[in-house]
């Protein structure tokens, strides 16, 4: 239910596009320590034909909850660019049933403070990585949009 | 348009080991998520393993020390191999792609495998 | 595991006639403002079809007859006016947790 504006790309390349690349830029670093297993939103959320509307929405939902995460204001700035950029390019009409969103990552059972700090560590890394991808997807699919491929 | 083509199925003594495949064509093969789902005679459906675009895995915990799920994105196909092979293992394997909300977009026709001695 | 449980196992239907399948899930599919539920069609000796996903999404290329409703635990297909290509066997099918589960399946015959 999204009738994706702004498909001849200028609003996508002058604004979304640069801000998806500070980003990734800022994230260089992060790759190589990331696990291989697979995160449950791109099991479930894909950038497929005919459905690139429903995964760029969803991916711009799971954005927002990546804000004031990272320290930088930079950071944050170019993250919400994304978010509501997409959300407003994409013009979509039917809003998905609002529900509480899901925290980022699961709670941990009280360990000591060394332990702790380790798994903070973990999680930060995880969610950095989740990130990291999320961006990747969300530039790809526009890309597919804007290429105008409808591939199955 | 998307295609998948089991292949490997037959008759096979219990205990006996068997691989199946599954070429694709039609899509980004290396782009997807792909899953093995199986059917006995006149049953219903039962979800075995999927493999994801990393080459990470999932099992159905049920048939995770017998079969194992693989693909090889340069011949864009899909594999599972079977191991101590059962007489309840009779039924139509089929590969499918992964969908939008984790479902089963795209099927192929099955290969039968009939464990028997 | 989560269970699913299909009603009826099967019915009678005549063309025209307003069909609803229901699937009760052992526990909620629904996870972060979605329900992973989707329904296939299956024919004898064929591959099933995939109708519908996410609940309620209407899968490309499938009649608008065909419509999904539900979220948590309570699902239904419906088939608005049955055609007679509609005779066959519907499973539903949960995606929120691994081991992805279906349920027993609906024969829709013809009476």
């Known amino acids: 239910d999204c009738d994706i504006e702004g498909k001849d790309g200028k609003q996508y390349e002058s604004v979304l596009m640069v801000s998806i690349d500070q980003l990734l830029d800022s994230m260089k670093e992060i790759g190589s320590n990331c696990l291989n297993n697979e995160f449950n939103f791109f099991k479930r959320h894909i950038c497929d034909a005919n459905k690139e509307g429903m995964f760029l929405f969803r991916a711009a939902r799971k954005l927002r909850q990546f804000l004031k995460m990272n320290s930088t204001g930079d950071f944050d700035l170019h993250l919400l660019k994304v978010s509501e950029g997409t959300t407003i390019l994409l013009n979509c009409t039917g809003q998905v049933k609002g529900r509480k969103p899901a925290a980022l990552g699961e709670a941990q059972p009280t360990k000591s403070l060394e332990e702790n700090k380790s798994l903070k560590e973990q999680k930060k890394l995880n969610d950095l990585c989740f990130l990291k991808r999320l961006l990747q997807e969300i530039k790809t699919c526009w890309n597919k949009i804007l290429m105008g491929t409808k591939e199955h | 348009q998307v295609q998948l083509v089991e292949s490997g199925g037959g008759v096979v003594q219990p205990g006996r080991s068997l691989r199946l495949s599954c070429a694709a064509s039609?899509?980004?093969?290396?782009?997807?998520?792909l899953h093995w789902v199986r059917q006995a005679p006149g049953k219903g459906l039962e979800w075995l393993a999927a493999?994801?675009?990393?080459?990470?895995?999932d099992y159905n915990a049920e048939f995770s020390s017998r079969f194992t799920i693989s693909r090889d994105n340069s011949k864009n196909t899909l594999y599972l191999q079977m191991n101590s092979l059962r007489a309840e293992d009779t039924a139509v394997y089929y590969c499918?792609?992964?969908?939008?909300?984790?479902?089963?977009?795209?099927w192929g026709q099955g290969t039968l495998v009939t464990v028997s001695s | 595991d989560i269970q699913m449980t299909q009603s009826p196992s099967s019915l009678s239907a005549s063309v025209g006639d307003r069909v609803t399948i229901t699937c009760k899930a052992s526990?909620?599919?629904?996870?972060?403002?979605?329900?992973?539920m989707n329904w296939y069609q299956q024919k004898p000796g064929k591959a099933p079809k995939l109708l519908i996903y996410?609940?309620?999404n209407l899968e490309s290329g499938v009649p608008a007859r065909f419509s999904g409703s539900g979220s948590g635990t309570d699902f239904t297909l419906t088939i608005s006016s049955l055609q007679p290509e509609d005779f066959a066997t519907y499973y539903c099918?949960?995606?929120?947790?691994?081991?992805?589960?279906f349920g027993g399946g609906t024969k829709v015959e013809i009476k």
């Open positions: 499918a792609r992964n969908g939008y909300g984790e479902s089963f977009a795209y």
């Open positions: 099918q949960q995606s929120n947790e691994d081991p992805l589960t």
């Open positions: 996410m609940a309620s």
């Open positions: 039609g899509f980004t093969f290396s782009s997807y998520g």
């Open positions: 526990h909620s599919v629904d996870d972060d403002g979605d329900s992973y």
């Open positions: 493999i994801w675009t990393g080459g990470s895995t």
